[in-house]
Amino acid sequence: SCNTATCVTHRLAGLLSRSGGVVKDNFVPTNVGSEAF
């Protein structure tokens, strides 16, 4: 799967949306690697 910074940002946005934003405070694009997905 795509591991560029932009792909990571969009995947994280989708994850946050599905979880209702209930994730760790530091779960942001610049803190998570592609392995987080």
Epitope: C2, T4, A5, T6, C7, T9, L12, V28, P29, T30
Partner: antibody, heavy 119, light 107 residues
């Protein structure tokens, strides 16, 4: 309100260097990557690279390696792009851009900085 | 590098019409394509990400479709303010690359 405010137009001589700034406001600067894009007159867009403001990590377009250096100052929420050994080919509008998720999910661009390289 | 080809440099349409702007990638980029609108003298403005998702505030007249190598931005009920360049971008691979743009002209 999310904003990316870029520094003003630059007129520089061939061979010189220039440092363009992009000050972010309205969101947590260190949470999102900052991209830099070149638009030569009448042409489309070229991606220069991105920087992770959290740790300073960068990805560069091979074409701009040795030409552009991307840095950040976390304390002022400002991203910088330095361009060196300037030639007329570097005359263009340069944009910073960042995709944020919070407070709003959007792809924001700065207003652009016009660089003119001329003797 | 991935080449993004927008074969139509100019397109002419009338207010109220429907127009489709196409973009072709030189390799499979999955759904990882964005579309931008750039009005004369302005910064690009994001319209679509992940090939088919509209950013907040983008009118539903703008619809993106496609995956792999072939992508389309469709503008329904064209308005006079849609006079602009429409540019695709792939972000599946580094370096990100942009299409050459399609200039939409209003008759």
């Amino acid at each position: 309100e999310v904003q990316l405010q870029q520094s003003g137009p630059e007129l520089v001589k061939p061979g010189a260097s220039v440092k363009i700034s992009c000050k972010a406001s309205g969101y947590t600067f260190t949470d999102y990557y900052m991209n830099w894009v070149k638009q030569s007159h009448g042409k489309s867009l070229e991606w220069i690279g991105d920087v992770n403001p959290n740790n300073g990590g960068t990805h560069y377009n091979q074409k701009f390696k040795g030409k552009a250096t991307l840095t950040v100052d976390k304390s002022s929420s400002t991203a910088y792009m330095e361009l060196r050994s300037l030639t007329s080919e570097d005359s263009a509008v340069y944009y910073c851009a960042s995709i944020t998720i919070v407070p709003v999910y959007f792809d924001f661009w700065g207003q652009g900085t016009t660089l003119t390289v001329s003797s | 590098d991935i080449v993004m080809t927008q074969s139509q440099k100019f397109m002419s349409t009338s207010v109220g019409d429907r127009v489709s702007v196409t973009c072709k990638a030189s390799q499979n980029v999955g759904p990882n394509v964005a579309w931008y609108r750039q009005k004369p003298g302005q910064s690009p403005k994001a319209l679509i990400y992940s090939a088919s998702y509209r950013y907040s505030g983008v009118p539903d007249r703008f619809t993106g479709s496609g995956s792999g190598t072939d992508f389309t931005l469709t503008i329904s009920n064209v308005q006079s303010e849609d006079l602009a360049d429409y540019i695709c971008q792939q972000y599946n691979y580094y370096p990100y690359t942009f299409g050459g743009g399609t200039k939409l002209e209003i008759k």
